[in-house]
């Protein structure tokens, strides 16, 4: 472990096409990859009318894009699916939009998934 | 452990499409990216663009924007790398690798364009 | 985004240290620790050497050692053994926000 770092050791797992993709729908994911490697957790979603559907949750590659950061904030201006990731355990529970472009108030408010 | 197979060679005329696949397995597909990289002959390495595997949202390199099409099918852990209106400067191995990190790479497909 | 400049080709004997230099723009290489390094013998996919600057895979022996100074990565190999002659790329991180670019290659020949 390098010090300073959070290490991703396991993350909120979600799966909505779980029946299809033979997974279970919910629980917590143990991260496994190269020992050389970073960890980190993952959450997407979409926004259909201003409902929140999630689409999945889990563990994340080595990617530079989720270094040191501890919340899932996905940043890129109106995606089509929204994606966030972060370092440290289960840190995907909570993720929220932010778009980068924006200069208002952004519309989301930080979301505390409850899976139907 | 970790592998990616690419499908097989293809020779295709100038002018039409041809269409790579890249089947993962060994590892969750959806939880990092696909990248695609070329090689002609006897020439360097060239990044096409990328594909994250969970959301499907992709990045192409300028050159081959409009051109290049990359898709992802997580019910079967396969991305694809389309490449239309093929010209002779196009004969290339085409590679997938995953991750931003290029850590694993699949054993590549040559595309020969051809009339 | 333009590609990385190598030189084309260097030489060593065996036993001894050939260093491959990267040079890139500070939006590139001088801005974030994210160059890899790959080896490719002919006919063969490349095989990462090095990413992240300096961290290197399992697997890879400790001879292979990455580093960077501005705009400038560096490889080093240590202990030239005939097996390392082949191409060496530079390239960076691909995924995100970040567009991926390779160097043209650099040929290593073990004299």
């Known amino acids: 472990a390098i010090l300073g770092r959070s290490e991703t050791q396991e993350c909120i797992f979600y799966n909505a096409n779980w029946e299809r993709d033979r997974t279970n729908r919910t629980g917590v994911e143990s991260c496994y990859g190269d020992k050389d490697k970073r960890r980190h957790c993952f959450a997407t979603w979409k926004n259909i009318s201003g409902s929140i559907e999630i689409v999945k949750q889990g563990c994340w590659l080595d990617d530079i894009n989720c270094y040191d950061r501890t919340d899932c904030i996905e940043k890129k201006d109106s995606p089509e699916v929204y994606f966030c990731c972060c370092e440290g355990s289960m840190c995907n529970e909570r993720f929220s939009y932010f778009p980068e472009m924006e200069v208002t108030q952004p519309t989301s408010n930080p979301v505390t998934p409850k899976p139907p | 452990q970790v592998q990616l197979v690419q499908s097989g060679a293809e020779v295709k005329k100038p002018g039409s499409s041809v269409k790579v696949s890249c089947k993962a397995s060994?590892?969750?597909?959806?939880?990092?990216?696909i990248n695609w990289v070329r090689q002609a002959p006897g020439q360097g390495l060239e990044w096409m663009g990328t594909?994250?595997?969970?959301?499907?949202?992709?990045s192409y390199a300028q050159k081959f924007q409009g051109r290049v099409t990359i898709t992802a099918d997580t019910s079967t852990s396969t991305a694809y790398m389309e490449l239309s209106s093929l010209r002779s400067e196009d004969t290339a191995v085409y590679y997938c690798?995953?991750?931003?990190?290029?850590?694993?790479w699949g054993q590549g497909t040559l595309v020969t364009v051809s009339s | 985004q333009s590609a990385l400049t190598q030189p084309r080709s260097v030489s060593g004997s065996p036993g001894q240290s050939v260093t491959i230099s990267c040079t890139g723009t500070?939006?590139?290489?001088?801005?974030?620790?994210?160059v890899n390094w790959y080896q490719q013998h002919p006919g063969k996919a490349p095989k990462p050497m090095i990413y992240?600057?300096?961290r290197r895979p399992s697997g890879v022996p400790d001879r292979f050692s990455g580093s960077k100074s501005g705009n400038t990565a560096s490889l080093t190999i240590s202990g030239l053994q005939a097996e390392d002659e082949a191409d060496y790329y530079c390239?960076?991180?691909?995924?995100?926000?970040?567009?991926?670019?390779f160097g043209g290659g650099t040929k290593l020949t073990v004299l």
């Open positions: 690798a995953r991750g931003g990190w290029f850590d694993y």
């Open positions: 060994g590892y969750t597909f959806t939880s990092s990216y």
């Open positions: 594909i994250n595997a969970v959301s499907g949202s992709t």
């Open positions: 500070s939006s590139d290489v001088g801005s974030a620790n994210y």
């Open positions: 992240g600057v300096s």
């Open positions: 390239g960076t991180f691909a995924g995100g926000k970040y567009y991926g670019v």
